[in-house]
């Protein structure tokens, strides 16, 4: 007779990372048996949400569940019928919604509503939506990281798990750019945070942690474009705006309403005498690199040093993984492997935005244009970011690593959040006595 | 000030389906959420599920889930509740409810008077 | 979901006299607890809500304490139409869920 296999004694999880841009679902996985042990969750599936992000369903909210549904569904097929109800499902909203919030704490509530009414629907364990804070989304992309590259682990190991992991404890720094806002998470060397907003102090594994965490809202690729075509639009002379940051013969007509739309350009806005206008791109990297530069106020720091409108930021320290849009972008840009030096990255970017319009939409034929427009701004942006805004040099850019899966799982700050509020991350080593609730993170 | 008026009391048969109704007068309707709780004979309350009128959003408790809808008509400011496959334990007071406030501020402050839905063959 | 436990079932107490009721979470509801009243034949009525705030026209005898997972209702002194059954009940996360209720009886 054949051997049956015992069931598996595995439990599951889903988030929802509700983006300014689209929402994407993770399921995760893990043996029931050792869930305080390091290293044993991963994702089994994610799926992109189609449409936009939450905040965009404001004047349509009644649409809310439908958008949901295709990913929901997905959910209950993969995980087992028997798991459904022990099976939590968080929904964590970021930069898009806190935007949402600001000018409108009412119809942000309203949006959170109907998302919270639509995923009670499903038979899983249902926990909640909430707008989670940048320093959450700093700090859970910091723990999501360390967690797969094996850092809170006591034992040192002998192999590497992945080719960038070097075999010491030292924690990796997290840095992660969404459509409107990035975050830069890491521990400083004997540094004291010179701002309490900047700080986090954690107990995992039986080991401090002292954690410097800003998110800088507004600043995601998404909303920093808008705020550099508000910026530029005050000093057109008429309602063509020659862009660098685009592809020569590259053409899109801009609403002046979509540009004030956003909080975001709030500090550029102006009255224009027209209602649109035309961006036609010169794609030219040096001068779109210098636009992009204007976005940073460095002329005031109440610190020692900051990286820019007068936000704290210590000396960097260590390896960084740079993940979401970081990576999304230099993928396509093909730019993340580990050999390319800033001083390449800056030439193929110059190189890449100097190439004509129809020639890109040839070469890259799969991409939608909304897209593939963007590039060339996205690419230019992140270098700018890192080197102008967070201070990394030439030589400190070897120690980057744009990473979009460790162990199959997805870099980002849904893994962490889960295993915060599982309970799955103890404060002291899993084998000292039973730990109650708040001893965890 | 806001009241909510309900359906008169059912005597229904087992397999059956009973519609009670909800109609509220004196206040904005579709804003506000209406929930639907149930209370058996000599038991606590039971939350069936809830609809905002305005965007036609229901939501049901496990339990009721597949037997329950909920639906609103804005036009006549009414909340109905369709409990369908009647079995004896369905008898019980079905009230509706307004919950006062939005995004987790589903305390229910508003209450109908009842119906009640006896089921028996 | 959340469950929500009451105790005691039932409390005896004379009129005049103070009254506690407990009300326990099984997971952390914050400060999103309403407590209700009723009385036979009639419909709830809602109390407290946000943990400690009393809803509109209600006496300032009764109020509401905690958060998180343990919460309170204490009638100061008890007056002849506050012997009811009393009901908490959390809206943190759907599905929204009752206790078992405590009936209040004259002693």
């Known amino acids: 007779t054949q051997n049956k296999a015992l069931p598996e004694n595995v439990k599951y999880g889903i988030v929802l990372d509700a983006g300014s841009s689209h929402t994407s679902l993770y399921i995760y996985k893990w043996p029931a048996e050792k869930e305080n042990d390091t290293g044993v969750v991963h994702q089994v599936e994610e799926c992109r949400v189609k449409g936009p992000g939450i905040s965009k369903f404001v004047q349509k909210v009644n649409e809310i569940g439908i958008y949901l549904t295709d990913c929901m569904e997905r959910a209950r097929e993969v995980i087992p019928r028997s798991q459904h109800q022990e099976t939590p499902v968080y929904l964590g909203a970021t930069a898009g919604m806190r935007l949402l919030r600001m000018e409108s704490e009412e119809l942000a509530d309203r949006v959170l509503d109907v998302v919270e009414r639509s995923l009670s629907n499903y038979p899983f364990d249902f926990q909640g939506a909430r707008i989670i804070t940048g320093q959450e989304e700093g700090a859970y992309g910091w723990i999501t990281i360390n967690y797969l590259l094996g850092k809170f682990s006591q034992k040192t190991r002998w192999f590497s798990i992945v080719p960038y992991e070097t075999n010491n404890q030292e924690t990796f720094g997290a840095l992660d750019l969404g459509g409107a806002s990035t975050q830069v998470t890491f521990v400083p060397q004997n540094q004291t945070i010179e701002s309490p907003d900047n700080a986090l102090q954690f107990r995992l594994y039986g080991k401090d942690y002292n954690v410097y965490t800003h998110s800088f809202l507004c600043y995601g690729k998404d909303q920093a474009l808008w705020q550099k075509l508000a910026k530029d639009i005050q000093v057109a002379s008429n309602e063509i705006l020659r862009d660098p940051c685009f592809h020569p013969g590259y053409k899109k007509v801009v609403n002046v309403s979509d540009l004030y739309k956003t909080p975001c350009t709030k500090r550029f806005e102006m009255t224009l005498p027209f209602q649109q206008f035309e961006i036609q791109g010169i794609g030219n990297y040096q001068q779109c690199h210098q636009s992009i530069l204007e976005l940073f106020n460095t002329s005031y720091c109440p610190y020692s040093q900051c990286a820019f409108n007068g936000i704290f930021l210590p000396p960097l320290q260590g390896d960084f993984g740079a993940f979401s849009a970081f990576y999304f972008v230099m993928k396509f840009l093909n730019l993340t492997s580990e050999k390319v030096s800033q001083e390449k990255v800056t030439e193929m970017m110059k190189k890449f935005c100097a190439q004509p319009w129809e020639e890109i939409k040839t070469s890259y034929a799969g991409v939608k244009e909304k897209y593939l427009s963007e590039y060339c701004f996205s690419g230019t942006y992140i270098l700018s970011l890192l080197l102008q805004g967070y201070h990394f040099t030439a030589d400190s850019w070897e120690h980057i690593h744009f990473i979009g899966k460790i162990q199959g799982s997805d870099a980002g700050w849904t893994l962490g959040y889960m295993l915060n509020l599982t309970n799955m991350i103890p404060a002291e080593q899993p084998l000292s006595t039973p730990l109650s609730h708040s001893t965890y993170v | 000030q806001v009241q909510l008026v309900q359906s008169g009391a059912e005597v229904k048969k087992p397999g059956s389906s009973v519609k009670a109704s909800c109609k509220a007068s004196?206040?904005?309707?579709?804003?506000?959420?209406i929930s639907w709780v149930r209370q058996a004979p000599g038991q606590g309350l039971e939350w069936m599920g809830s609809?905002?009128?305005?965007?036609?959003?229901?939501n049901y408790a496990q339990k009721f889930r597949g037997r329950v809808t909920i639906t609103a008509d804005e036009s006549t400011s009414t909340t109905y509740m369709e409990l369908s496959s009647l079995r004896s334990e369905d008898t019980a007071v079905y009230y509706c409810?307004?919950?006062?406030?939005?995004?987790?501020?589903?305390?229910?402050?508003?209450w109908g008077q009842g119906t009640m839905v006896t089921v028996s063959s | 979901e959340i469950v929500m436990t009451q105790s005691p079932a039932t409390l005896s107490v004379s009129p005049g006299e103070r009254a506690t009721l407990s009300c326990r979470a099984s997971?952390?509801?914050?400060?999103?607890l309403a407590w209700y009243q009723q009385k036979p034949g009639q419909a709830p009525r809602l109390l407290i809500y946000?943990?400690?705030t009393r809803a509109t026209g209600i006496p300032a005898r009764f109020s509401g304490s905690g958060s998180g997972t343990e919460f309170t209702l204490t009638i100061s002194s008890l007056q002849s139409e506050d012997f009811a059954v009393y009901y908490c009940?959390?809206?943190?996360?759907?599905?929204?869920?009752f206790g078992g209720g405590t009936k209040v009886e004259i002693k």
């Open positions: 409810a307004r919950e006062s406030g939005g995004y987790r501020d589903h305390r229910l402050d508003v």
């Open positions: 004196g206040g904005t309707f579709s804003s506000y959420a």
């Open positions: 609809i905002i009128p305005i965007f036609g959003t229901a």
């Open positions: 997971q952390s509801v914050g400060s999103n």
């Open positions: 946000g943990a400690s």
């Open positions: 009940q959390q809206y943190l996360i759907w599905p929204l869920t």
